[in-house]
């Protein structure tokens, strides 16, 4: 029978001589070289060969676990005269022994991760994984243990499961966004004379609402006209928030002030900026100055932040009033006066008022407009608005009488309105009756 | 040419009251806004307020909330200003000046009236 | 409230001298800016207005500069009647004053 143990071999033999195996043998072998011994299989005659009558085997190279851990192959043994088999031909294993050549390499070269900004100690960041092609079942070539050899103190990895964790509190997005961690992984546990590898992990800190919104200013200062129409923008307001995205988002509200139903404020969705926008009518002559108070908030708020204070700000907002000239305003829409038509000339029938509506209350002259008079019938006192008559009136020719005063600034021509004047003549009995009459 | 006079110097009590004038002349006085501003001894100058003659409308300083009131005459072209309960801390002298504009409640002062000594003293 | 910071507070300079002041205000007033001068005794007077603006009748030696939050007032050449103490004063929002720079005699 066959005489022989597993074989084993140790991988990239460096010696000079070729890489003694083992020996085969039969127990049907006496020394005296009778029998031949034949190798086949996995390599024989090439990687491996025999001699055949010792039964010797040696490795003619180097060899790599890694590429091949375990040959198969098989004996004969042949009795050299007869050519016959002493032994059945028999299987048996070259099993290739590892030694620690090769590091740890990591599945990705570079890994890119992301955390929020702020994150407790020991957060999650990404796991890296290292294999090592030696043999995880025989001494500790292929134990890897990580380590970070950059990125401290913001970042650790746990030795064992290549976790990366937070490491460091408060960490700012504000301050620093990107961090490149270097993790190694050394094989033999870690020890002396392990191998080791590396990987590059970009780690990029994201965004939380950790900053509340800031005027640059504390006061701004905008000016309108009063004839500004509900809806017009008077000026633009914009609080910075050092977050980004929606942690970024600011809503402006006008929350005090005299101007608060005067005046609104909308939020520019794509500048961010807070609109102040006219509400209501103004009137120079009734306020010149409004004092506001505009906040800018964030919507979207992390309750957890809420101990670094309010998420919002305020600004003063000083609305200053212009002044429009306005025209006189009279004191009706339209004026109705009665005169009897035997009224003699420079006859007062009446009187209209006007005022300039403007705070400086500027003096008003009136006249009548000659295109509703061309037969110049009546007249007015440009200083008190008094209407009279400068010519006679004859109801029978003209009943109604429609007119046109107009009110005119006197520093300012240009301003003016117009008022238009119903002057009804009244009858007398100045006529003779007309026809024949028969009596009975 | 634009004028600002205003009265002369006044001593006052502790406690009191103390009303100074500012007689305009040279332009339209309603179209103006006026405002005061004092000066302590060797010190800076201080905004009070304003007057806009053409309506009465006002508006105060702060500080001087509850204590100033700046009224006008049209009929005279005068402002006044009456600060009350006077410590010894106003003591100063109180200018009047003339807002450039007449359209709205902003700019520079382009002329101002010669200015009023009010000391206050027990 | 805005407030005006103007420096120095007081400079010793002689008859033809380049002097310059400076006005800071606490918040961006844009060209909110103006210069007067007072002398003892007297009423501050308008030199310049929306921080460059020359007021007429003033000499052309006086000239203002900046905006937004840093001004300065230069006078090129120092005359006799120079000397005085000179406010910068605010009106983008109310009406602030600068506590003044007193330009003496060397």
């Known amino acids: 029978s066959w005489m022989w143990n597993q074989f084993f071999l140790l991988e990239e033999y460096t010696g000079s001589d070729y890489q003694y195996v083992g020996k085969l043998h039969s127990d049907q072998d006496r020394g005296d070289g009778s029998l031949k011994y034949i190798l086949s299989g996995d390599g024989a005659g090439d990687l491996f060969i025999i001699n055949e009558n010792t039964g010797d085997i040696q490795a003619t190279k180097r060899l790599d676990r890694e590429e091949k851990p375990v040959y198969i192959l098989r004996a004969q043994a042949i009795n050299r005269r007869t050519g016959r088999p002493v032994e059945p031909e028999s299987e048996f294993i070259i099993k290739i022994h590892d030694i620690n050549d090769n590091e740890p390499i990591f599945t990705k070269e570079v890994y890119t991760a992301t955390v929020p900004e702020m994150s407790d100690v020991g957060t999650f960041v990404v796991q890296v994984t290292a294999t090592d092609a030696d043999d995880p079942t025989y001494g500790n070539s292929a134990k890897v243990v990580y380590s970070i050899l950059q990125g401290q103190p913001y970042f650790s990895v746990e030795s064992e499961t290549g976790i990366i964790k937070t490491a460091l509190l408060n960490m700012d997005r504000e301050n620093r966004e990107q961090y490149q961690v270097v993790i190694q992984a050394k094989d033999m546990g870690g020890q002396m004379g392990g191998l080791s590898g590396t990987t590059t992990v970009n780690i990029t800190l994201t965004d939380v609402n950790d900053n509340p919104p800031r005027f640059p200013q504390s006061t701004y200062q905008f000016k309108t006209p009063e004839s500004s129409p509900p809806g017009t923008p008077i000026g633009r307001i914009k609080a910075s928030d050092a977050d980004v995205g929606e942690n970024a988002e600011i809503e402006y509200s006008i929350t005090d002030g005299e101007g608060l139903d005067m005046f609104d404020v909308i939020t520019d969705q794509e500048t961010q900026e807070g609109i102040i926008t006219v509400k209501k009518l103004l009137d120079f002559e009734k306020k010149k100055v409004y004092t506001l108070k505009v906040e800018a908030s964030n919507p979207y708020v992390e309750p957890r932040f809420l101990y670094l204070g309010p998420f919002k700000d305020s600004a003063t907002v000083r609305i200053v009033v212009e002044d429009v000239d306005e025209p006189p305003v009279f004191s009706k829409l339209a004026y109705i006066l009665q005169i009897r038509e035997d009224a003699q000339i420079n006859t007062t029938i009446g009187s209209v008022t006007a005022q300039d509506p403007d705070a400086a209350r500027n003096p008003v002259k009136y006249s009548v407009d000659r295109h509703t008079d061309m037969d110049r019938i009546f007249n007015i006192d440009s200083g008190n608005g008094s209407i009279f008559t400068s010519k006679l009136l004859d109801r029978e020719t003209l009943l109604w009488h429609n007119i046109t005063v107009i009110a005119t600034e006197i520093n300012n021509p240009k301003q003016s309105s117009r008022v238009p004047l119903y002057i009804k003549v009244l009858d007398v009995n100045d006529n003779a009756p007309t026809g024949l009459s028969t009596g009975a | 040419e634009v004028q600002l006079v205003q009265s002369g110097a006044e001593v006052k009590k502790p406690g009191a009251s103390v009303k100074v004038s500012c007689k305009a002349s040279g332009y339209t006085f309603t179209r103006n806004f006026m405002h005061w501003v004092r000066q302590a001894p060797g010190q800076g100058l201080e905004w009070m307020g304003w007057i806009y003659p053409g309506d009465g409308e006002t508006e105060y300083a702060q500080k001087f909330q509850g204590r100033v009131t700046i009224t006008a005459d049209t009929s005279t072209s005068t402002a006044y200003m009456e600060l009350s309960s006077l410590r010894s801390e106003d003591t100063a002298v109180y200018y009047c000046?003339?807002?450039?504009?007449?359209?709205?409640?902003?700019?520079?002062?382009?002329?101002w009236g010669q200015g009023t000594l009010v000391t206050v003293s027990s | 409230d805005i407030q005006m910071t103007q420096s120095p507070s007081s400079l010793s300079a002689s008859v033809g001298d380049r002097v310059t002041i400076t006005c800071k205000a606490s918040?961006?007033?844009?060209?909110?800016l103006a210069w007067y001068q007072q002398k003892p005794g007297k009423a501050p007077k308008l030199l310049i207005y929306d921080a460059n603006t020359l007021q007429t009748g003033v000499p052309s030696r006086f000239s203002g500069s900046g905006s937004g939050s840093d001004f300065t007032l230069t006078i090129s050449s120092l005359q006799p009647e120079d000397f005085a103490t000179y406010f910068c004063q605010q009106y983008y929002s109310g009406w602030a004053f600068g506590q003044g720079t007193k330009v003496e005699i060397k």
């Open positions: 000046a003339r807002g450039v504009y007449g359209g709205f409640a902003g700019g520079y002062f382009d002329f």
């Open positions: 918040q961006n007033i844009y060209k909110n």
